[in-house]
Every structure is written in C-alpha cells, then in structure tokens.
C-alpha cells in the first residue's frame, strides 16, 4: 500500500521536510503532489512525468518544493503555513490512479526568552514578586528553574498564565536566588539568562560579641554588633541610653568600674524601614569572673561514731570569695554539733554520729561566679561488739542478746561490715 512518511514530523520554521514515499507502484506514467487531503487542481504543487523526467510546477507551487524521481517531495525553508496534509496522486501506465496522504506540523524556532519582573526590590514577609517569561509563544511549554534546579513545591509559589508567570507570595530571604525560564516546543528549547531575586530583609535582632559580661579594670572593651540585613544595617551604640557613635564596633580602652552599665546596639535598615536593638550588661569589677575549683581536706575520712570529731577544710586560692557547705544536697550547718569557722573555711563536726556519714562538698562564690569542689565521703563506724554477742549466718551478723543492745536494734539484721572486719582482725 502506498504510504507517505514525513521526516521529520515536527518541523522547525526555516528548516526542511522530506515527504518520503513508500511502496511506489511499478510502471508509472507520473505523479503529482497536492496541498491538502484530496486531489484538487487548484492546489497542485508540482507534477512529474517519468518519461521526460520533467517537473512541472502547479498553482500551489511556492518555489521551495523539489520533487524526486522516486516521487518523494522535499520542502525547504518551511513556514508556518506549510503545516498540514499533503496528497500524492500516482498515475500508472494503465491510467489507474492511486493516492496517499501524509502530514507534518510546523513549529517556530523559539527565540531566547527573557524574564520580566513586577518588583525588583521586594521586602521579606511583605511583598510578592511575579516573574513573566517573555515572549508569549503559541504552542510553547514554559518551565522555571531556581538555582538550576526545578521549582520546589511550596504553597508560596504559584504558576499561572499557562506556566508563563511565576509568582512568589510573601517572599523570604531564602527566595534570593537565580531564576531562569525555559521555553520548549517539539523542535526547540531555549533558556533565559538568570535573573537574581534580591529580597530585602532585616535587620534581625542584633548579636553583640564577645558574650563576656565581666571585665577587669584597665582592660580594653571591644564590642562588635551584627544583624542579618539586606542591604547591610547601619549601626549605632548607646551606653546607659546615651548615644555614643554610629559604628558597628565600639572600642573603649582602659576601662574602669564607671564603664559598667547597659550597652545598646541599634541596627537600622533604611530601605525596609525596620530597626532592632540588643542590650548587653557590662560589669567592670576586680572580682574574678572565673572562680577556681576548691578542694576539700579532711582531718580523717573514717571516724568512730559518738567518739571522734572531724574537721573538713575548703581550700581555695581565690580572694574576695564566700564559702558554703553541702551535705546530701542540704546546706550546712544542720545541727548544733556542726560549726563553721575561719570565714566558713572549716567545717567541724563534734562528735560525729551515724547520720553524719555521707557525701560533703563545698562551694566558693563571689557575686559573679561560683565553683564547687569534688565531693568527699565521710565514713562513720562504731566499736566492735564482743565475740560472744555475734552469730555469723550467711555472712551477715546478728545480735544475740545479753548486751542490752537488743532493746535498741530489736534484733534486726544489720550489714555491719566494719565491726566484722574488726572482729576478724583480733582473731
């Protein structure tokens, strides 16, 4: 069966297309091509007589068509109006006719697109920006790229106008990026130059660095202020509410206690019309801002209850500090047997009782800092009971009476390892 194949099917304007004939019959007189889906003399493009090898142009000939001896038709410099159907009429030697129809589509070679914007300086969380891909082209598909990636999914991004317009609602600083649009049709794809979206924002709440609060007299005070802002913020400093200077850095050499106070950094963005402040307290003092870790020394760590006394001493090299004591997370002293002396450096317990056994630590502090010692364990023992009063059962010691201690302990089971050890020592 006679068929027509268009190569290519989708043709770019200005290019060429070949209407290729398949299964051409034998013993032909000639053939003619027509524009459209039927044979119409007024729409004849070109004819060809095989015997004379002569081509004859028809009424629809444009000067761009060339017929091959095998009946295929080449059309050059394609124009939009060439889109559609083409019919080949074959006249056989027996004058029996045969027809076949083919078609192709014409698309423009796309120009390089460009992006127009309705707002070149949008403000964060306030403005929307609409990008439009120009020019508007029939039968073109529009795509958008952000930093050379396809569009992220976001409720703030909206495509409209056949994807030709990209709208960003309530822009954020994160929308500051490179935007490109791309136009595509079956014969070409073109990408625009980048448009950089410059979102104006800030200033954010300023940060004052360094974070130190305490300074010694004679030191240099150097403070720096930074607030994220586009365009960059303008900075000013106030001390105790009084304007000092319009700089990002504040430097005061050789400070004294009189420089203590509240230091305010003011950041302003004249384009967004926003400003923010941060207040930092500076304290100039002789006191050490870092108190060293104290150490506890004990006259002994294992004592005999109701007999011995013990002295715990909190050692520190810092001056101008205070000391406090803790036992089992409770502040001391907690009984009349406990006494503090030498400005709380020494804790004395006299006499030591069973309930005094446990963990002790001290804390040294001044108005601006504190530090605590490692804990120390105080062990409290009682004198060993006579041999005849103890029965050893499963490594546990039980009282057997005759000593009057039964009244006190009610014959309860006690893990009294120190007494047991003492007993074995005398064996």
């Amino acid at each position: 069966k006679l068929t027509i194949e268009s190569t290519p099917f989708n043709v770019a304007e200005g290019k060429e297309v070949l209407l290729l004939v398949h299964n051409l019959p034998q013993h032909l007189f000639g053939y003619s091509w027509y524009k459209g889906e039927r044979v119409d003399g007024n729409r004849q493009i070109i004819g060809y007589v095989i015997g004379t090898q002569q081509a004859t142009p028809g009424p629809a000939y444009s000067g761009r068509e060339i017929i091959y001896p095998n009946a295929s038709l080449l059309i050059q410099n394609i124009i939009q109006n060439d889109t559609g159907f083409y019919t080949l009429h074959v006249i056989k030697s027996d004058l029996v006719n045969e027809e076949a129809t083919g078609q192709f589509r014409v698309y423009p070679e796309l120009p390089k697109p460009s992006i127009s914007s309705n707002n070149s300086k949008p403000v964060e969380d306030k403005d929307a920006v609409a990008f439009t891909c120009e020019p508007e082209t029939q039968d073109a598909t529009y795509l958008w790229w952000v930093n050379n990636q396809s569009l992220p999914v976001s409720p703030r991004l909206q495509l409209s106008n056949g994807n030709r317009t990209l709208t960003l609602f309530n822009v954020t600083r994160n929308d500051s990026a490179s935007y490109k649009c791309e136009t595509q049709n079956p014969v070409s794809a073109r990408r625009s130059d980048s448009v950089i979206l410059n979102v104006l924002y800030g200033p954010d709440t300023p940060t004052i660095s360094p974070s130190d609060t305490y300074y010694r007299p004679g030191a240099n005070l150097s403070l720096s202020c930074y607030a994220a802002s586009n365009p960059p913020a303008q900075y000013s400093w106030l001390i105790n509410g009084t304007f000092q200077q319009s700089t990002q850095e504040l430097f005061i050499p050789n400070i004294t206690v009189n420089n203590s106070g509240s230091y305010t950094c003011h950041a302003n963005n004249s384009v967004t019309g926003c400003n923010r402040t941060t207040v930092k307290t500076i304290i100039v003092t002789e006191l050490s801002p870092v108190v060293a870790k104290p150490q506890i020394k004990a006259s002994k760590t294992t004592v005999t209850g109701d007999k011995d006394s013990v002295n715990l001493t909190c050692s520190t090299n810092d001056t101008g500090i205070s000391i406090r004591w803790f036992f089992k997370n409770q502040s001391l002293p907690s009984s009349e047997r406990m006494k503090l002396s030498q400005g709380n450096i020494t804790l004395s317990i006299n006499p030591v009782k069973r309930e005094d056994a446990g963990t002790y630590w001290c804390e040294v502090f001044n108005p601006i800092s504190k530090n605590q010692s490692d804990p120390i364990m105080l062990n409290v023992n009682y004198n060993a009971l006579p041999q005849e009063n103890l029965i050893n059962v499963d490594e546990q010691l039980y009282f057997q009476g005759g000593s009057g201690l039964n009244d006190i302990f009610e014959a309860q089971k006690i893990e009294w390892h120190e007494a047991r050890a003492h007993h074995h020592h005398h064996h």
């Epitope: 000067g63 017929i67 091959y68």
Partner: nanobody, 119 residues
Framework: EVQLVESGGGLVQPGGSLRLSCAAS????????IGWVRRAPGKEEELVAG????????RYADSVKGRFTISADTSKNTAYLQMNSLRAEDTAVYYC????????????WGQGTTVTVSS
C-alpha cells in the same frame, strides 16, 4: 504562473566570460534556493552552482570552483551565473533550477540557454 526563463548564453572563446540570467516569476527567489544545471551531449547532467538567499549560502561543483560565481538580485527576482575562464568542457545547455540547500536534488523546467566555448 510559475516560470524560470534563462538568457545570456552564446559563443565564446576559451578563457572568455559570459553572464547568464534567470528571471523567476510566480514565486520569490529570496524564499528558496536557485541554481544552474548543465546538460551536455554524452555527459552526465551536472548541478554547477546554487544560492539560497534565505540562508545566504552558496554551493559550487568542484569543476567550476574559482571560475563561476552565482548571485541573486531579489528586487528583480533574478539569479545570475558569472562564468569566467571558460573552457571547452563548459559547453552545454544551462538550465535555471530550483535546488536543494543540502541535497543533490533539483527541478528545472525552462528552455535553457546554450553556452558554446570554442576557438
């Protein structure tokens, strides 16, 4: 009506020059590729030159390169073939043709103009 009418042929001595003209009607030569084909007895038909006004490109057969120049005047809808340093083997009937920019295919239907190179 679509027509291609050739003129400018004649008798010329070897080494001489001729200028052929092709007047087109019924279509614009600026939209297509136009050229010259020659037929000589006992020789194969040869496409000697072509010009595509819409791309600005020209093409020549190796046998005429450097001697023949094709041009077009779109305001007159006419194509020309300037033939210099003519040789006896250039003797042929020259036809104005619609040619392909990229393929060796063409159509012509004019009467042609005869060029004879002889001393």
């Amino acid at each position: 009506e679509v027509q291609l009418v050739e003129s400018g042929g004649g008798l010329v001595q070897p080494g001489g020059s001729l200028r052929l003209s092709c007047a087109a009607s019924g279509f614009n030569i600026k939209d297509t590729c136009i050229g010259w084909v020659r037929r000589a007895p006992g020789k194969e038909e040869e496409l000697v030159a072509g010009i595509c006004e819409y791309t600005g490109s020209t093409r020549y057969a190796d046998s005429v390169k450097g001697r023949f120049t094709i041009s077009a005047d779109t305001s007159k809808n006419t194509a020309y073939l300037q033939m210099n340093s003519l040789r006896a083997e250039d003797t042929a009937v020259y036809y104005c043709a619609i040619v392909s920019q990229s393929r060796s295919v063409y159509n012509y239907w004019g009467q042609g103009t005869t060029v004879t190179v002889s001393s």
